[in-house]
């Protein structure tokens, strides 16, 4: 998905809506005319601003993804909130699409963290403790190397 | 449009320029500020709005003050570095069609 | 603030060549942008608007385009006077994101 929000302004801005700007910025849910002197209101669920602003222009809602759910639809003065689907997440890092989460741990760790639209499962070693980090195998089912060896989604 | 006030000054002294319009309204028009060193790009600075609201690029902010009268709008550096040795530019903005029309600018060197 | 990125830096073509500036905006502007001229000593001057907009006076040789992140200044038929320094610069937002200019392109004709 794609968002794009206002920077948040760095002063106290006036808290009633008008139709005319004031000190130089239209409400949220409004952008600035052309002239500079009124404000116009977004269009509900076509696009929005979440606050005090001088753009020409409102942003335009986010449309959830094919595996997305939509929490909160976009209002004047809110995007869209979208969420992955059961099953799948969406990390930080790669943030255009949802992934799906693994069914398992590899052999010798231990579930802690269940699968959430945020994060994947989390997996502990059984011994120590520490988390697990990088690519592993699907599921614990599917490790062939022997005792000892360390996991390898190559072996 | 135009700039006046620009000189020499000693680091650390704080200057105001000038900005005097004729044949329009500052009470209508926004206002920019624009600097260019010696060489180098357009640099913006700051504009304060037809009701009288300034505002300013992150890296301006506590270094100048804009402000203005019926007739003029002023330029304040509250305390001049030499990195601020450039020509000054105060130009009308309008919202959708940009900065219309500029002045000729005003040099300002800051030198020990 | 917008950051606007312009390339290139310099560019250099012969009399009745064409020249290709980009710039590109940090955030989406629409099609509010503005291209400025300026040669040395002088202050810039406004070459378009919004995008495409030909200011008063300006040879259709000058073209503009582009909307949301993404504009072109196009100059064709070059000439020994359109030699100079160009800037671009976003008009949406300018109290909440600021109005940075570009980094100028130098257009050398040779």
């Known amino acids: 998905i794609t968002q794009q929000d206002l920077a948040p302004q760095q002063r106290a801005a006036p808290q009633q809506k008008r139709s005319s700007p004031s000190e130089g910025l239209c409400p949220p849910g409004h952008h600035i005319s052309e002239d500079g002197r009124d404000c116009i209101s977004c269009k509900y669920g076509q696009d929005y601003s979440t606050h005090w602003n001088d753009l020409l222009f409102c942003l335009r809602c986010t449309r959830c993804d094919s595996g997305e759910v939509e929490l909160s639809p976009c209002t004047t003065t809110r995007n869209t909130v979208c969420q992955c689907e059961e099953g799948t997440f969406r990390e930080e890092d790669s943030p255009e699409m949802c992934r799906k989460c693994r069914t398992g741990c590899p052999r010798g760790m231990v579930k802690v963290g269940d699968c959430t639209p945020w994060s994947d499962i989390e997996c502990v070693h059984k011994e120590s403790g520490t988390k697990h980090s990088g690519e592993v195998p699907a599921v614990e089912e599917t490790v062939t190397s022997s005792p000892g060896t360390p996991a390898s989604p190559c072996s | 449009v135009e700039e006046s006030g620009g000189r020499l000054v000693t680091p650390g002294t704080p200057l105001t320029l000038t900005c005097t319009v004729s044949g329009f309204s500052i009470s209508r028009y926004a206002m920019i500020w624009v600097r260019q060193a010696p060489g180098e790009g357009l640099e913006y600075i700051g504009f304060?709005?037809?009701?009288?609201s300034a505002y300013y690029a992150s890296w301006a902010k506590g270094r100048f003050t804009i402000s203005k009268t019926s007739t003029t709008v002023d330029l304040k550096m509250t305390s001049p570095t030499t990195e601020d040795t450039a020509t000054y530019f105060c130009?009308?903005?309008?919202?959708?069609?940009?900065?219309?029309?500029w002045g000729p600018g005003t040099l300002v060197t800051v030198s020990s | 603030d917008i950051v606007m990125t312009q390339t290139p830096a310099s560019v250099s073509e012969p009399v009745g060549g064409t020249v290709t500036i980009k710039c590109q905006a940090s955030q989406s502007i629409s099609t509010y942008l503005s291209w400025y001229q300026q040669k040395p000593g002088q202050p810039p001057k406004r070459l378009i608007y919004k995008a495409s907009t030909l200011a008063s006076g300006v040879p259709s040789r000058f073209k503009g385009s582009g909307s949301g992140t993404d504009f072109t200044l196009t100059i064709r038929d070059l000439e020994c006077a359109d030699a100079a320094t160009y800037y671009c610069q976003p008009n949406s937002g300018i109290a909440t994101y600021g109005a940075a200019f570009g980094g100028g392109t130098e257009v050398v004709v040779k």
């Open positions: 130009a009308r903005y309008t919202y959708s069609d940009g900065t219309d029309l």
């Open positions: 304060i709005t037809s009701d009288s």
